[in-house]
Structures are given as structure tokens and as C-alpha cells.
Interface confidence: low
Amino acid sequence: SAPGEDEECGRVRDFVAKLANNTHQHVFDDLRGSVSLSWVGDSTGVILVLTTFHVPLVIMTFGQSKLYRSEDYGKNFKDITDLINNTFIRTEFGMAIGPENSGKVVLTAEVSGGSRGGRIFRSSDFAKNFVQTDLPFHPLTQMMYSPQNSDYLLALSTENGLWVSKNFGGKWEEIHKAVCLAKWGSDNTIFFTTYANGSCKADLGALELWRTSDLGKSFKTIGVKIYSFGLGGRFLFASVMADKDTTRRIHVSTDQGDTWSMAQLPSVGQEQFYSILAANDDMVFMHVDEPGDTGFGTIFTSDDRGIVYSKSLDRHLYTTTGGETDFTNVTSLRGVYITSVLSEDNSIQTMITFDQGGRWTHLRKPENSECDATAKNKNECSLHIHASYSISQKLNVPMAPLSEPNAVGIVIAHGSVGDAISVMVPDVYISDDGGYSWTKMLEGPHYYTILDSGGIIVAIEHSSRPINVIKFSTDEGQCWQTYTFTRDPIYFTGLASEPGARSMNISIWGFTESFLTSQWVSYTIDFKDILERNCEEKDYTIWLAHSTDPEDYEDGCILGYKEQFLRLRKSSVCQNGRDYVVTKQPSICLCSLEDFLCDFGYYRPENDSKCVEQPELKGHDLEFCLYGREEHLTTNGYRKIPGDKCQGGVNPVREVKDLKKKCTSNFLSPEKQNSKSN
């Protein structure tokens, strides 16, 4: 029988009455157009909803938008369109919500053709009040908040000017012209690329990378011949054109661009690309596209300086620049990532790593599933996960994989069981141990979300017909109850719950259609009465993450340490609560060769933990570029994995000597850099 339909499933007592008392309908007085929803702040209960409706007239498009505000997690909404003077808001800029709990909101308005500049509406009190501000420029991008100070905003204009505000959008100053891309760094630093001749497109590969640390008072050119740049963790990356041909290479800086090193990565040609898949303060996952229109490339993982890279995964699916990749960080368990590879026969297969890219394996076949038509051997196959690529290909996959840092070990995803991803209708699978084991959770495609730090999982069937039923589980997807939240089915458009998965409220969005009109409607369900009591100590159990062999003393050791978590028992029906903090107990492991990556000039043969010298470098001095100087490396082939905390045990020797010579291959040497002040 399907999960949730057997006798073992204990039913939640009187749940229909409890949920009926906590189901709140709101019908929006709108013609159906588009709707966007934003949460303002954390645990504030404030939601802003913007509805827009376009009427295409013969000579122009007439637009109308309405703004609604809720301060009770979506149970009730108030029309606050008059606070923005009934102005039509541009949906392509969305609602720019300030970082943390600043309570700041910026809405960008549509203005008539001949106006001198754009118009914004600003709120700094969680959208209770708005101030209208006319801009001295037409914005090209959404206002970007400095992560360190929400009063500092930057925006690019349609004429490629870089504009900065120091007083939350009240006053604006153009600090530079001819800007292609701008990003906030740390400490209110702004990085941006500029063009000298024609345009961003024409100068691609001849751009300059600039930095200002004082909001435009002074500038420093930190790179030339730039194609593009990116920030990840504590790393600043730039792809730089080679002197002699059309190839480009990645350079990396860990000091905001003062000094650069060339990353030991392959160079790429005009049609190829680099992509930072994930980065933290320890390391980076970098995708390097394969030559030709193959749709795949190679994942490399960096050392702690972002310079030396180890090949992590071949034939990694990534369709085109800015295209689709299935690379997913499983945030519910440290070190776990899932992605897809394109195999030789053109089929797509899912791979998982539990040690931050050290080794990749197939996902274990769920015990309650059979291998499908893609499997050569009906008894041996794997789970394959549908993610961004499947969604882009219009497969019947309504949602990407889901995991939450505070719902430890839980991963939910659509998938199929075979030798490759199948085009057939997928089912929903769940893992409760960070991807080591999987179970079929629901038949067919569903929308799903996690509430109360994993205490409740909610799902709605993906259907082209109107729906009025929601499913929920209080035991991590083993057993399911169904609740009819309305008598009149609605055309479902989305599930919304507060980011962070701490809430116990879920909003079901959709529209009703009658003979002449259609209207937006939301149903917000509060599950607080289903989880009647607060969880106590007895409701939690100790769980060792990454445990595969309890007999082994090193069981659970990943990146040099193991972690024990307190996790809610599946049988406990209680509230983790909004203030729930994940309780974990780390313990350090002894070092083994698994705790080291292969150093520059070395590689790991398949299924071997030893690093061996690359044949082409045997007997050569190992010299490489570091901070614009040439370094000589004395090594026996190992370098500690970034973030690895192991102690004792195996301890390979390495030493780096400064050769006191300049690198000729480094295009970003400090001599080429200059400073200027406004």
C-alpha cells in the first residue's frame, strides 16, 4: 500500500475540526493577472502581496496593481494601495526587501515615457508607511542593499550609470558611468566592471574591474582585460582574457582584489563558461564548461585559497551560460550536494556527494520502489532526482528538491528509480538522513513544504484540475492525513510559507474562475492546534550524522569531525516552536588520507585514496603563481581539505618557498593596478 495508507499510521485526533478553526480565506478584489508575495522580516508575520493586471490596448498597455499587507502570517490582508498613491508597480523589479529585520521595503513604480527619472516608494517600518521618491535616473536593476548597512543602496541606470544612496534611497549620487555589473562585497565595498569604448557587450573581455570602499569617494582599478567577475564566500573571482588568444582564465583574490593568483583551472574559449556552483568561506565548487555544445563540463573543488583545484566530477550537466544545472546544496546536512551528470548514452543520472565533492556516488534505491524501464537490471538501480533541468524541460515536476538547515537530515525531491532520469510522471521521495537512504513519500508529482523545523510536512497534488485538498504528515512523510480546506475547489498556483521553515502557517494560493471573472484567493492554515504541546526532552533522540558503519570507531567522520544531533522522534506529535535551535555535539576525528585533497601536480586514481604525481609533471619543479609571485612547492602530494578539522593520525608534509620571481602569466599583477579619487 502507498505510504500513509496502512494500519500502522496513527491518525492525528480530531484534526479536521482543529484545522477548520484555523483556516482563513481571503478573496482579493482583483482581476487575475500576476501575483507576487514577499515576507518582510523574520518572525514578524508581515507579508506584502502585489497583484498586477495588464490590459493590452491598441496603442499601449494599461496596467493596474494593488498592494496588500498582512501582519498575521497571511490570515488577513488589508489593501494598502493608497499608501503608494495607487501607482502601478513594476513587477520585473519585484519588491526589494531589506536584509535581516531592517523592515525596509523598496517598490519601483512604472513612470510615463517622458519623465526625467524613475520613481520608488520606500518604507522602513515593515510597510506600514511609504515615502514616494522621484529618482534622477531610470533604474535598470532592482535596488541592491548593502548586506552590512541597509541604508546603503546601489542601482544601475538604463544609461549604465552606477548610482548609490547613503540614506535609504532618499538622495542618490552617480558615482561612475559606463558600468556593466556591480555587486556589494563585504564591509560596504562595491565591485564593478566598466567599459571604455562602445558598450558592455562590445568590450567583453576588455572590461576593467574597479573597487570603491567608501561609496564612491575613491576608486581602485583592481583588474584589466576582464570578461566577468563573481563573489563567493571570501573569494573574489575574475575571468580574464589571455594576451595572445581568445581564451580566458580564472583569477582569484582573497583580499578584495589587492593581490591576485591564477586559479589552477583549465582556460576556456569564447563559447565556454565558468560558473561558481557554491562557495563558502572555506572553499568553492567551480564548473568549467567542456568545449563544444556538449551540455556538460567538469566540477572542480578548490583548496582554502581558491587556487589549487581538484577534479571532483566529470560530465556534469550544465546546459549553457546562465542555463540549467541540477547542482543542489543539501542544507539539512553538512557536506552533502546533489547534481546530475550526462552519461555517454545521453541519459541523465543523479549523483550525490557526502564529503563536499571528494567522492560522488549514485543515490541508493528506495526500498519500497521497483526499477523502471530505464534499468538494465530490474534488481539494481538508483534513485534519480528531478531538479532545475527537468523543470526547464517542462517535465511534470512542479518543484525542485527541498531541504532546510533546521530540519536536520530531511531532503524531499521528485524522482524516478532506474538507470537514469525518466520522462515519465515522477513520484516524491524523502530522505531523513541527508540523502543516504530514501523512501517513496507520495505517488505522483506534488508541491511540498516543511513547517515547524520538520515537525510537519505539507503537500498538495500537482494537477491541472481545481483542488481543495491538502495533505500533511507529522512523522517526516511516513503517514499522511488529508484535509479539505474549502468546499469550492480553486486553481492552485502556489504554496507559501515563511522562509526558514519555522512557521506553522501555510498559505495556499490560487484563483477561482466564474463565467465572467477570475479572482485571486488565498487560504492560510495554522497547524498550531495539530501540534498541541511543546516538545520536551523525551521527544528527542540522539542521531549520529553520516553514520554508515556503527561498528567503526571513525563512523560518521566527515571533513575531520562527526556530529551528533538531537532529533525529534517520528512518533512525537509536538511543536519544535519558533525558537527551536538545532542541538548538535561535534567531536574531532583522527586524520586519514581522506582528509586531504591532492595538491597541485598530483591526482587521485579512481578508487584510490593515495595521491600520485601527474605523469606530465614527474621530475619537474612544481612552480605556480601566487599573489603575482612564482612559488616553489615541496610536497608529497597532499593538502588538507578546506574546513576539515581532523587532528593527529596521518600528517603528510608540504612546504611552499617563495621563488622571488614575478609570474609572467598573471594578468592582474599589482603593477597594473592604480587608484584614483573623486
Epitope: 548514452d345 524501464a373 533541468y389 517542462k394 517535465l395 511534470n396 520522462v423
Partner: antibody, heavy 125, light 108 residues
Framework: QVQLVQSGAEVKKPGASVKVSCKAS????????ISWVRQAPGQGLEWMGS????????NYAQKLQGRVTMTTDTSTSTAYMELRSLRSDDTAVYYC??????????????????WGQGTTVTVSS | EIVLTQSPGTLSLSPGERATLSCRAS???????LAWYQQKPGQAPRLLIY???SRATGIPDRFSGSGSGTDFTLTISRLEPEDFAVYYC?????????FGGGTKVEIK
Amino acid sequence: QVQLVQSGAEVKKPGASVKVSCKASGYTFTSYGISWVRQAPGQGLEWMGSISAYNGNTNYAQKLQGRVTMTTDTSTSTAYMELRSLRSDDTAVYYCARDPSGGTTLHYYYGMDVWGQGTTVTVSS
Amino acid sequence: EIVLTQSPGTLSLSPGERATLSCRASQSVRSSYLAWYQQKPGQAPRLLIYGASSRATGIPDRFSGSGSGTDFTLTISRLEPEDFAVYYCDQLGSSPRTFGGGTKVEIK
């Protein structure tokens, strides 16, 4: 050149079985699947199922499940379709077609690009 | 299952005219999984278009395919005498594979 050659016409009584063959030539048989499609007189096309010549995996239409069996013989590059418990509404022309998606999953569908000439099966008492 | 509805059922046109055939799906179909076939009386179907818009080997460029989601179109820019036949669309976007009911293009 690439071609699929099917066995000759058959006349069967209701309740009997029929087995149609489809011999492939001009390409690597195991690199593709074979799909079977039928067409009742004056009607449209109806997909019956697919088989992977690579691993023998099958995928049948729901309405024929239990009555149809598809097999391949890689030594002779031949695909077979057997239909049991024949009824009068099984009277149709039966086609085999080369199908890149048959039984295995590509991330792109290239269509059924080569077809057999068709086998007429008449079911009559 | 996904139902493919082809329209019109019959299209009466003269040689040299443009033919536009429609195939509508009951739910969204991945465009890379839609194909068009031509069938003449007494013959097996012939693949014309795969991936909604890619011409199969040997198919003249007067045949073109377009569309995405639930609406797909086969266009024959200038009808030649040999183009009068029945045309079927076919989807493999979700199981089971289904064909449309067909559009007959006949000489006016």
C-alpha cells in the same frame, strides 16, 4: 540502407494469438528501441508499447497490459510483438518503428524515424 | 494521459497554398518530446518533425514546426501535390505516449 521488414498478413479467429516479427537492418539494433503502433481501418494511430533492444525493458499501453508481449532477438536483429486473446476490434495494420526512446530515457526525443511496411491482422470468426 | 487534439479535422487547399495544422495538448508537453508524422493511403507513417521544430533527415524545408506548452503547429509553406496526406502529432512527454486524431490535407 536502414530498414525494418515485417512479417506477412495474418487472419485469426477471436481468442487466438498472433505474433508479428520485425527484422532490422542497416543500423546497430541494440542502440535503439522498437515501438509498436497499430491502426484500425479508417482510424488514427494507437501506440501499443515499446521495447529497448539494448536491455529488453518494455513499456506497454495500459489497455493492452496482460495481452501483449514484446521481445527482441539481438542475434538476428529482430523484434517480435505477440497479442493474445484476439478480439474483432484488434483488426488493424500493425507497424513497428525504430524509436530512440524505447525503454531507455534520453533527455531528448528524436521521433520514430524508421517504420516497417505494416502487417495486416484480421480477426474474424 | 495527455490528450492531443488536432484541428481542423480536414483541410481543403490547393497546391501552392500555405497549410497550418494545429495540435493542442490537454496539459503541458515538453517541446523536445513532440513529433509530427505524415501518412499517405496504404503507406506507413513518415517522421517529419521531432523536438517540436527540428526537421527529420530528408524532409524539405517547406515543412516547419513550432510551439510550446500546450499549443503546437505544423506549417507547410507551399503545398506540393505529394503533400496531400494525413498528418499526426505525437507526444512522449508523459506516459503513455499518445497520438493526435490526425488532420487530413486534401486537394480543393
